[in-house]
Amino acid sequence: GELETSDVVTVVLGQDAKLPCFYRGDSGEQVGQVAWARVDAGEGAQELALLHSKYGLHVSPAYEGRVEQPPPPRNPLDGSVLLRNAVQADEGEYECRVSTFPAGSFQARLRLRVLVPPLPSLNPGPALEEGQGLTLAASCTAEGSPAPSVTWDTEVKGTTSSRSFKHSRSAAVTSEFHLVPSRSMNGQPLTCVVSHPGLLQDQRITHILHVSFLAEASVRGLEDQNLWHIGREGAMLKCLSEGQPPPSYNWTRLDGPLPSGVRVDGDTLGFPPLTTEHSGIYVCHVSNEFSSRDSQVTVDVLDPQEDSGKQVDLVSAS
């Protein structure tokens, strides 16, 4: 007769490993006992279990509660055992020794390989700012056995680069995603996708992109200069910009302090009933942590008793 086994058995971390050992004997041959041992654990063999045809299964103390026989029906020539809840430390070499009658003893070895699913981590790169060149947006690292696959899922245009480092039978994979930051990328998801034979489904980690920028400032409210006349109520100037982080606004008057009664409400400058005192050059200052912008306008309050309207100049400066 001969022993049938596998030279390598693969199991996912936490699952049960079947260690096969089947005696294919001639008619009338019987298996008396099967002894299982781990044989790569340093000095000598470490007993796992003894499977006796008459007395059943005896598990050594080190493996108490972890070694069982496969569920029935059982073939009396089958010396296979189940190793419950495989851990990485179980990875190694095992031997079954089969005592048969009348053919004598046989032995076979197998190697148990434990697949270790990765626990990926995503690390954002440095702060992204519009105007930068190709910049690291994020890196994603996953270590497992065997090597995980790390890819990216995103609508954002960019380039990826990967590097891998191998341990014995496991590997750490790092993938980097580089892009040229633009404001259109703000709020866009960048997802690291990790695949591995030990995972039922891909693992995904999503990072939301934040790109610092500040748009040019402009002032709205002077489109119809004829509305800016003495006595008009509800006149206002509104400063237009956008940015990330959201910008703050400040209003000043270039040719003196803001006239009394003029209200500053964030991006809006509200005027009381207009007088000629409100004529002047107004500056909107827009700033965030990334940059600052200015836009200035000239307000000329018209006297309806005068025939000719006045020109209104809009000047933007950065």
């Epitope: 065997p146 891998s164 191998k166």
Partner: antibody
């Protein structure tokens, strides 16, 4: 019997290419990471490349971009495609199986790069 | 990259005497998650491929005589042949398989005095 047999070595001019093969038998090839290691005459061992069970590949800086390791599990075969060969690549090339360290080695195939 | 340095480069020992080879790695090869040192020792005889003797710094490969033993942790390792036999004449290499690029020591030649 567990065995690795290399082939494909020979004489090649600088700048030329060569493809080495390693035939595996006696074990479940697809379950093992595999390596190429080289040894110049009278010199020590130098690790050349590795490939994992899922096809992940690894190289030292000395051969990166010039050498490509691959495997064909259905044929129990390991390959090393060597391009832009240099005199310094002259060596005996061994394929090896990794378990804890490299536990099985082939007998090696000789690559000579010379004009 | 991890650099492996062996000492001495060569060693002459009388039959039956102890031979000791040292190997130093430029950084630790101890993997904290399983407390194993990813270091192997190989024996290479003339005209033959290397043969794995020791892995995890101190675990003997199956079939290797017990006169061969390995010790050490972190960055400093030792291969000891407790009683040198004629068939032990060879070059011995240490190798780290902690991370790629895997690297070997330059080798130590053991001869009989």
């Amino acid at each position: 019997e567990v065995q690795l047999v290399e082939s494909g070595g020979g004489l090649v001019q600088p700048g030329g290419s060569l493809r080495l093969s390693c035939a595996a038998s006696g074990f479940t090839f697809s379950s093992y990471d595999m390596h190429w290691v080289r040894q110049a005459t009278g010199k020590g061992l130098e690790w050349v490349s590795a490939i994992g069970t899922v096809g992940d590949t690894y190289y030292p800086g000395s051969v990166k971009g010039r050498f490509t390791i691959s495997r064909e599990n259905a044929k129990n075969s390991l390959y090393l495609q060597m391009n832009s060969l240099r005199a310094g690549d002259t060596a005996v090339y061994y394929c090896a199986r990794e378990w804890n360290g490299m536990d099985v080695w082939g007998q090696g195939t000789t690559v000579t790069v010379s004009s | 990259d991890i650099v492996m340095t062996q000492s001495p480069d060569s060693l002459a020992v009388s039959l039956g005497e102890r031979a000791t080879i040292n190997c130093k790695s430029s950084q630790s090869v101890l993997y904290n998650s399983n407390n194993k040192n990813y270091l192997a020792w190989y024996q290479q005889k003339p005209g033959q491929p290397p043969k794995l003797l020791i892995y995890w710094a101190s675990t003997r490969e199956s079939g290797v005589p017990d006169r061969f033993s390995g010790s050490g942790s972190g960055t400093d390792f030792t291969l000891t042949i407790s009683s040198l036999q004629a068939e032990d004449v060879a070059v011995y290499y240490c190798q780290q398989f902690y991370t790629t690029p895997y690297s070997f020591g330059q080798g130590t030649k053991v001869e009989i005095k």
